[in-house]
Amino acid sequence: SGRGEAETRECIYYNANWELERTNQSGLERCEGEQDKRLHCYASWRNSSGTIELVKKGCWLDDFNCYDRQECVATEENPQVYFCCCEGNFCNERFTHLPEAGGPEVTYEPPPTAPT
């Protein structure tokens, strides 16, 4: 039974490779999937000597290890590309690295949007 999952309809979208892949660079993505399948948001990034380089953000298809995650938290120690997923609209706005070996928790906040 899937109890009380947060329904994901929209995610923050970002693509660092937007020019080559001919997509938008950033914005919102409306998630679409098959009936009876859950949807998630994700974020992926690199960490080069403490400098965070966003790779992609967007919608993620039904993946059991993403179920019931309210926050986007990556736990791998030192991957080439960090990955996290979560459930709930725009839950991938902030993302966190919480290494399994018990290192410091690092949360990445989106830059404040400039007033229009």
Partner: antibody, heavy 118, light 111 residues
Framework: EVQLLESGGGLVQPGGSLRLSCAAS????????MSWVRQAPGKGLEWVSA????????YYTDSVKGRFTVSRDNSRNTLYLQMNSLRAEDTAVYYC???????????WGQGTLVTVSS | QTVVTQEPSFSVSPGGTVTLTCGFN?????????PSWYQQTPGQAPRTLIY???TRSSGVPDRFSGSILGNKAALTITGAQADDESDYYC??????????FGGGTKLTVLG
């Protein structure tokens, strides 16, 4: 090093109950979905049940629905499978497995044997 | 009820190439089912070989590769060795928490 250690198997009469445990170490248990998979003697692998990181979502194969209950205690790093109304066809080695992104089983325990016989 | 099908048995000569397949009764296998492959020798726990269609698990030699062939998932072993003689299982993730195993393929390495 990731370790999954199942226990609680044994011989039980038809209609009886058992509770299997899987003690996890070497990874952040509360951050991993988990699953139970079984293998009857001389047969193939069969997915039995899965539970999300919080325990809020649980799923079962049709043949065990209403008889088996999967649960987890994240403070004890332990996964459980409560098996009631056991039948001869539930006789199998039961494995616990860690579920990773892309919904695959990245680590397996060594298994515990459940025998249902009178 | 979803049934995932694999060849019951297969033989390969040492050094040869073999492709095992994994299909199901209600359509074509695609990457959205996250096909994964596992190797099991008698009396042992399964070992993860391939996940997400074609990604090798850590420590798995590059003789093992995964793909989609037509409407099925496939596991190819190139340069087969004696210790590749095992049972091989595919798993498809159907969504909504449900995983389905194939019936398994018993691979024999001749000679």
């Amino acid at each position: 090093e990731v370790q999954l250690l199942e226990s609680g198997g044994g011989l039980v009469q038809p209609g009886g109950s058992l509770r299997l445990s899987c003690a996890a170490s070497g990874f952040t248990f509360r951050n991993s979905a988990m699953s139970w998979v079984r293998q009857a003697p001389g047969k193939g692998l069969e997915w039995v049940s899965a539970i999300s990181v919080t325990g809020g979502s649980t799923y079962y194969t049709d043949s065990v629905k209403g008889r088996f209950t999967v649960s987890r205690d994240n403070s004890r790093n332990t996964l459980y499978l409560q098996m009631n109304s056991l039948r001869a066809e539930d006789t199998a080695v039961y494995y616990c497995a860690k579920v990773y992104y892309y919904s695959f089983f990245d680590y397996w325990g060594q298994g515990t044997l459940v025998t249902v016989s009178s | 009820q979803t049934v995932v099908t694999q060849e019951p048995s297969f033989s390969v000569s040492p050094g040869g190439t073999v492709t095992l397949t994994c299909g199901f009764n209600s359509g074509s296998v695609s990457t959205s089912y996250y096909p994964s492959w596992y190797q099991q020798t008698p009396g042992q726990a399964p070992r993860t070989l391939i996940y997400n269609t074609n990604t090798r698990s850590s420590g798995v030699p590059d003789r093992f590769s995964g793909s989609i062939l037509g409407n099925k998932a496939a596991l190819t072993i190139t340069g087969a060795q004696a210790d590749d003689e095992s049972d091989y299982y595919c798993v498809l993730y159907m969504g909504s928490g449900i995983h389905v195993f194939g019936g398994g393929t018993k691979l024999t390495v001749l000679g």
